[in-house]
Amino acid sequence: HAPEDPSDLLQHVKFQSSNFENILTWDSGPEGTPDTVYSIEYKTYGERDWVAKKGCQRITRKSCNLTVETGNLTELYYARVTAVSAGGRSATKMTDRFSSLQHTTLKPPDVTCISKVRSIQMIVHPTPTPIRAGDGHRLTLEDIFHDLFYHLELQVNRTYQMHLGGKQREYEFFGLTPDTEFLGTIMICVPTWAKESAPYMCRVKTLPDRTWT
C-alpha cells in the first residue's frame, strides 16, 4: 500500500549525466531502511508503457546506469523508481524529462602538456562517449557538438595570462621564460548548449636554456 507520503521512502530521483553517461540516482527517505528494495523503469516521451530495467529490479543500491537505454540524443526520457520497504510499504517517484544533449555535463578534457625551453605545447585528446553511430563506432564529444571548441589559458604570473582557443587539438604558447613554472587550464566549450567543462589543469615548467652553459 502507498505510504502517507512517498517522500518518507524515496527522495531526489534524478538523472546525473556526464559525457553522456546517464546514471539514475535517488535517496532513501527518513523511513527508508537498508533492506528497502528499489525497482527501476524507464520510457520515452509520449509512450504509454514503462519498461523494467534489467539488473535494476529489487536492488538495494541507490543508483542505476541507464546509459544504453537513454542513448538517443534527440529523445526525451523519463525514469521512475519504486521503493518497497521490508514492511511492504511502497512509493514511486519519477524524474523530470531528461534530454542527454541538454542535461549532460562535460568532464575536463584529456590533455597532454609538453614542456619546451621557450614554449609549452598542449595536445587535447578526443573525448569518447558511450554514444554509438549507426555503424557501431563510438562518437566523441567533437562528433556530437559541431560547435565545440577548446579554451586554453596559461597563467604567466599573478597579473598576466595568455589565451588560446579553437577547434584544433594542438596548441602552443610561445615566448615563455625558460626554467619557469606555469599553470595551464584547458576547458571544453559548447556555445549552442551553453556548456563549459570543468578545467583540466597542468602545472608545467619550461626547460632550462642549455645554450648558455
Epitope: 502507498a2 512517498p6 516521451y45 509520449g46 534527440t74 523519463y78 519519477m94 524524474t95
Partner: antibody, heavy 116, light 113 residues
Framework: EVQLVESGGGLVQPGGSLRLSCAAS????????MNWVRQAPGKGLEWIGE????????TYNQKFKGRFTISVDQSKNTAYLQMNSLRAEDTAVYYC?????????WGQGTLVTVSS | DIVMTQSPDSLAVSLGERATINCKSS????????????LAWYQQKPGQPPKLLIY???SRESGVPDRFSGSGSGTDFTLTISSLQAEDVAVYYC?????????FGQGTKVEIK
Amino acid sequence: EVQLVESGGGLVQPGGSLRLSCAASGYSITAEYMNWVRQAPGKGLEWIGEINPSTGTTTYNQKFKGRFTISVDQSKNTAYLQMNSLRAEDTAVYYCARFDAYFDYWGQGTLVTVSS
Amino acid sequence: DIVMTQSPDSLAVSLGERATINCKSSQSLLYSSNQKNTLAWYQQKPGQPPKLLIYWASSRESGVPDRFSGSGSGTDFTLTISSLQAEDVAVYYCQQYYSYPFTFGQGTKVEIK
C-alpha cells in the same frame, strides 16, 4: 482503477481567488505527470499547464503564467490549481488530466463561474 | 504556439456511414527521434470529460472500437469513423503535443443525419 476527482469550483467575484483540487486514486500521483485543462461554456479545450508531482517541476501555458499556479501534496495524492485575479473570461469547467503528452485519464471537471 | 484547425466544424452522417474529420497544424508534428507524429484525438460527449481515442496520430487507445482510426503525417491528419454508430454522436478534438503549450483544435461536432 485510476480515478481523478476535481473539487473546489463555484461562484467567485471578479478579482477573486479560488483553489481547485484534483484527488487521484488507483495509482500514486507521483508516478505520472498531471495537467490542468479548461473548457469555457460551449467552447473548446485549453491547456493550462502541467506538473511533475514527484519533483514539483511545472510548465505553464504563457497565457496563464503568473495568475495560475499548479502544485501537489504527495501525502494527499492530490494536485491543485490556484487561480488568482479571476476574470469573467475564466468562467469554465476545469479538468485535471493525467500523462505527459496527451491525456489518458480525465476527471469529471469542476465548474468555475466568475461573476459579480 | 502551434495552431490546430479542424474541418468541418460540424458533420452530419447517416448511421453506418463513414465520418471523416480533418485536423491541420500550423507546423509539422513529426517527432524526429521516433518518426511518429505528436497528435492525439479525443471524443467528448455532452456533460462528460474528453476521452482519449488515438495517440501518435494512428495508435488506438486500449478499449476504443476499431471503427475509429487515425492517419496523416506532418501537418495534415484525419480521424475516420468507418461506420457511424448512435453512440458516436459527440464533439471530436485533435491535440498536438509536439511543443508547449499543448494546443487543441476547435472541435468538430458529429451528428446523425
